[in-house]
Amino acid sequence: SRLRQEDFPPRIVEHPSDLIVSKGEPATLNCKAEGRPTPTIEWYKGGERVETDKDDPRSHRMLLPSGSLFFLRIVHGRRSKPDEGVYVCVARNYLGEAVSHNASLEVAILRDDFRQNPSDVMVAVGEPAVMECQPPRGHPEPTISWKKDGSPLDDKDERITIRGGKLMITYTRKSDAGKYVCVGTNMVGERESEVAELTVLER
């Protein structure tokens, strides 16, 4: 085919941006290109071409008419992580190709299983009490808070310190007795540990 005067090579006019998305949620990596003839767009992750519904109708990834890559749901397991990585879109026509900036897609996860559940504690009034938990693995790293008898623990109480997975009460009162739960939270949601009972005995 002859080169037509009005034809021009592709250029990327909208680059994809870095994303952090919860597992199972939809996501879009944007890409828009100009060129004449209209360029075709393909996506690559880590140097491998990304399969979309154009290759397999059952794919959870769709190439939109705009050139954007749409994920019906982000797929991410313990060992298989097909969607996580660094993506580029490539626009091509007969005059050449244009490559977008890199865009990283990170997957936010929060597993179900606490690595350590808090244990029951029994102390005398006035003694210190310590409960410890390790939240489920997560990305971003989950923050830890505590509930007592179903309500968020008042960490403004100067006797109470929450550091890492440790809940420390420097000197216990009878009113501290109750059922405690460790809560791990990130952008995915929250997970509650098994219940641990704090028993405060009269001296």
Epitope: G46, V50, G77, R78, R79, P82, D113
Partner: antibody
Framework: EVQLVQSGAEVKKPGASVKVSCKAS????????MHWVRQAPGQGLEWMGW????????KFPQKFQGRVTMTRDTSITTAYMDLSRLRSDDTAVYYC???????????WGQGTMVTVSS | DIVMTQSPSSLSASVGDRVTITCRAS??????LNWYQQKPGKAPKLLIY???SLQYGVPSRFSGSGSGTDFTLTISSLQPEDFATYYC???????FGGGTKVEIK
């Protein structure tokens, strides 16, 4: 079409090694963990370990450590399982299986029969 | 290692029967449990993942339930093609249960 195609049946002598291949097609090879599972005649399924095709890192249950090697060649989207110091009780059908993002083995190879006999 | 115990190891049933197979984990595994079907001379086939999610293309007569340590695979109305061996697998440590063979009565 997503599929795993394994190498053909093997007959080996005790003490020898066997290398089984598993050619993946129809999906992004580097994105999915690859596992090996075996099944002795008339017995159940026994998980042998897995390889991360992206990094080449492997993990095996204690039973197979030191005797099994798992490798991959990303340029030809093929995983390999090498079992050494073969014994008669290694006679089994060996399967490769892809692990989905839902932590389950959703695609299996057709199996490779390995017979260990003197 | 987490040990998976399936019961029964075999059962006889008729077409149309409701069949239940159980799998017990030696420690809590949340919902990290899968079920597979295997026919003689064939590779296993995934039926259920994450304890209760039906794999694409699997008939709705198959269902899974349970969490923690006790899990169940149910076939609501047994069909001739369902006579096979069924395996549970925990997806944390990846070990399989011993299998349940479903035979024709």
């Amino acid at each position: 079409e997503v599929q795993l195609v394994q190498s053909g049946a093997e007959v080996k002598k005790p003490g020898a090694s066997v290398k089984v291949s598993c050619k993946a097609s129809g999906y992004t090879f580097r994105g999915y963990a690859m596992h090996w599972v075996r099944q002795a005649p008339g017995q159940g399924l026994e998980w042998m370990g897995w390889i991360d095709p992206r990094t080449g890192l492997t993990k095996f249950p204690q039973k197979f450590q030191g005797r099994v090697t798992m490798t991959r060649d990303t340029s030809i989207t093929t995983a390999y399982m090498d079992l050494s110091r073969l014994r008669s009780d290694d006679t089994a059908v060996y399967y490769c299986a892809r692990e989905s993002g839902d932590d389950a083995f959703d695609i299996w190879g057709q199996g490779t029969m390995v017979t260990v006999s003197s | 290692d987490i040990v998976m115990t399936q019961s029964p190891s075999s059962l006889s049933a008729s077409v149309g029967d409701r069949v239940t197979i159980t799998c017990r984990a030696s420690q809590k595994i949340s919902s990290y449990l899968n079920w597979y079907q295997q026919k003689p001379g064939k590779a296993p086939k995934l039926l259920i993942y994450a304890a209760s999610s039906l794999q694409y293309g699997v008939p709705s007569r198959f269902s899974g339930s349970g969490s923690g340590t006790d899990f169940t695979l149910t076939i609501s109305s047994l069909q001739p093609e369902d006579f096979a061996t069924y395996y549970c697998q925990q997806s944390v440590g990846l070990f399989f249960g011993g299998g349940t063979k479903v035979e024709i009565k």
